[in-house]
């Protein structure tokens, strides 16, 4: 009679994670008597996957019953396959000894080969807020997935981006992989509600790539534009002196003012409006007893925003003559609205 | 969580006789192929010895053939090794290791320190 | 046997910096049926046991950071640590485990932080 071959017919087999694998094994003959063991590994730390005798395998079930007299399929199925299982199988005959068991001969194996999904991206941004004209860099991570093939891309606010560096590691065979990648985008003013998302595509997603998003509402800093102008008089010897602070974000301002140099008032910014592109305005006023006076006044409002270094608009205010209306333009940026009065 | 505890070293006189035990645990004893790995004074380490999984196989370092018998229980989830005819050149911390599932170790026990010396 | 051959015997190095180390065998680690390269790496800290990083010469084990690079093919096989922590402060070992007996270790690379 011809000797008995151990026959695995699948050279390779791809399962997702959490499925079940099955690893085909069949005998040619029933000679000689001995048990089947499954092993990943062909080397002398090979690790017991079943063993037909004995043992504790609680995720292998057989396909067929070992049991029955002629059974010469011996395939095993393995039960929430993670990317730990990778390797190649063995199925091997022994032939029946004493006291112990001889091996007998070995299929050819089966490279088991694990496809896992990549884990959510997570996108994260600078750590300190930047003004807008600036470049910072946002980076994205993924973890886990298996085979090594996947594709990333970065958009904000759904064009794509090109300046951006990607690696996937480790560079050699492993069980399952990560990708990380880090884009450069440049701020704009109008950037407060934009977002950047890294998108990465890979084989068990089956064509629904998975997305991690970052706010640049986190990362940008719009700096204030002020403009201080004098109001026409309200009362006899009062004037009406107002501080607008425009197109600012975040929100945290503090505002002081200084008559001479001297603090007058200081407020923070609270009841702000809302510009369409998420920056804010907020104005302040100051009233100025003009009588107190006897020379010139220098009104000054000073912006703290976001604690920066402050930024100042300066009023000269006449008060030899009746006050007329006057007015002076500052440069500088921030955004809130909050209109109140300060007597 | 894998854990792999040797004990039984000591001092013994060169031709003296010494049986190291390893207490495993965290994993199913029987599914692994155990191994015992040395590591001399200068730090070079050996492998010494590997009991296979599934079925009675014993693998040995030749300079230890006939003198080092690896053993194991799979009932106690324990690993031994009976060193007999000690040599000088046998000094070493020997240590008890979980083969991975083509020969590497992947886990390793804190060692037992053996001294062979008259 | 395969002799296994790490150079260099110790290095220093500062935090941060990029860390090579070479391993070489006396014959070919690769198996040609599954392409493979039967090569470990382990890292033993003082007072320590040594602890698995690579096998299969780049396949990094389960919670071994991602700054341990494992790489090479045939005889030549390097450790590389992308950048170098503290704690990295270690003897690094490499391993042919071929199923051709015995198992070899190379003599070590002892790395110190600066």
């Known amino acids: 009679e011809e000797e008995l071959q151990v026959i695995q017919p699948d050279k390779s087999v791809l399962v997702a994670a959490g499925e079940t694998a099955t690893l085909r094994c069949t005998a040619t003959s029933l000679i000689p008597v001995g048990p089947i063991q499954w092993f990943r590994g062909a080397g002398p730390g090979r690790e017991l996957i079943y063993n037909q005798k004995e043992g504790h395998f609680p995720r292998v079930t057989t396909v067929s019953d070992l049991t029955k007299r002629n059974n010469m399929d011996f395939s095993i199925r393995i039960g929430n396959i993670t990317p730990a299982d990778a390797g190649t199988y063995y199925c091997v005959k022994f032939r029946k000894g004493s006291p112990d068991d001889v091996e007998f001969k070995s299929g050819a194996g089966t490279e088991l080969s694990v496809r896992a999904k990549p884990s959510a991206p997570v996108v994260s941004g600078p750590a300190a807020r930047a003004t807008p004209q600036h470049t910072v860099s946002f980076t994205c991570e993924s973890h886990g997935f298996s085979p090594r093939d996947i594709t990333l891309k970065w958009f904000k606010n759904g064009n794509e981006l090109s300046d951006f560096q990607t690696n996937v590691d480790p560079v050699g065979e492993s069980v399952s992989y990560s990708i990380h990648s880090t884009a450069k985008v440049v701020l704009t003013r109008e950037d407060v509600h934009s977002q950047v998302i890294c998108e990465v595509a890979h084989v068990t997603l089956q064509g629904d790539p998975l997305r991690g998003t970052a706010n640049l509402s986190e990362t940008i800093r719009v700096p204030p534009t002020l403009e201080v102008t004098q109001q026409p008089v309200r009362a006899e010897n009062q004037v009406n002196v107002t501080c607008q602070v425009r197109k600012f974000y975040p929100q945290r301002l503090q505002l002081t003012w200084l008559e001479n140099g001297n603090v007058s008032r200081t407020e923070t910014a609270s009841t702000v409006t809302e510009n369409k592109d998420g920056t804010y305005n907020w104005m302040s006023w100051l009233l100025v007893n003009v009588s107190a006076h006897r020379d010139d006044v220098k009104l000054t409002c000073q912006v703290e925003h976001d604690g920066q270094p402050a930024v100042s608009k300066s009023h000269d205010l006449k008060v030899s003559a009746h006050p007329k209306e006057q007015g002076s333009n500052t440069a500088a940026e921030n955004t809130g609205s909050n209109e109140r009065n300060i007597y | 969580e894998v854990m792999l505890v040797e004990s039984g070293g000591g001092l013994v006189k060169p031709g003296g006789s010494l049986k190291l035990t390893c207490a495993a645990s965290g994993f199913i004893f029987s599914n692994y192929a155990m191994s015992w790995v040395r590591q001399t004074p200068e730090k070079r380490l050996e492998w010494v010895a590997t009991?296979?999984?599934?079925?009675?196989?014993?693998y040995y370092q030749d300079s230890v053939k006939g003198r080092f018998t690896v053993s194991r229980d799979n009932a106690k989830n324990t690993l031994y090794l009976q060193m007999s005819s000690l040599r000088s050149e046998d000094t070493a911390m020997y240590y008890c290791?979980?083969?991975?599932?083509?020969?590497?170790?992947?886990?390793w026990g804190q060692g037992t320190l053996v001294t062979v010396s008259a | 046997d395969i002799v296994m051959t790490q150079s260099p015997s110790s290095l220093a190095m500062s935090v941060g910096q990029k860390v090579t180390m070479s391993c070489k065998s006396s014959?070919?680690?690769?198996?040609?049926?599954?392409?493979?390269?039967?090569l470990a790496w382990y890292q033993q800290k003082p007072g320590q046991s040594p602890k698995l990083l690579v096998y299969f010469a780049s396949t990094r084990e389960s919670g071994v950071p991602d700054r341990f690079i494992g790489s090479g093919s045939g005889t030549d096989f390097t450790l590389t640590i992308s950048s170098v922590q503290a704690e990295d402060l270690a003897n690094y070992f490499c391993q042919q485990h071929c199923s051709t007996l015995p198992w070899t270790f190379g003599g070590g690379t002892k790395l110190e932080i600066k």
């Open positions: 290791a979980r083969s991975g599932w083509d020969g590497w170790f992947a886990y």
């Open positions: 014959q070919s680690l690769l198996n040609s049926s599954n392409q493979k390269n039967y």
């Open positions: 009991f296979s999984s599934g079925g009675s196989y014993t």
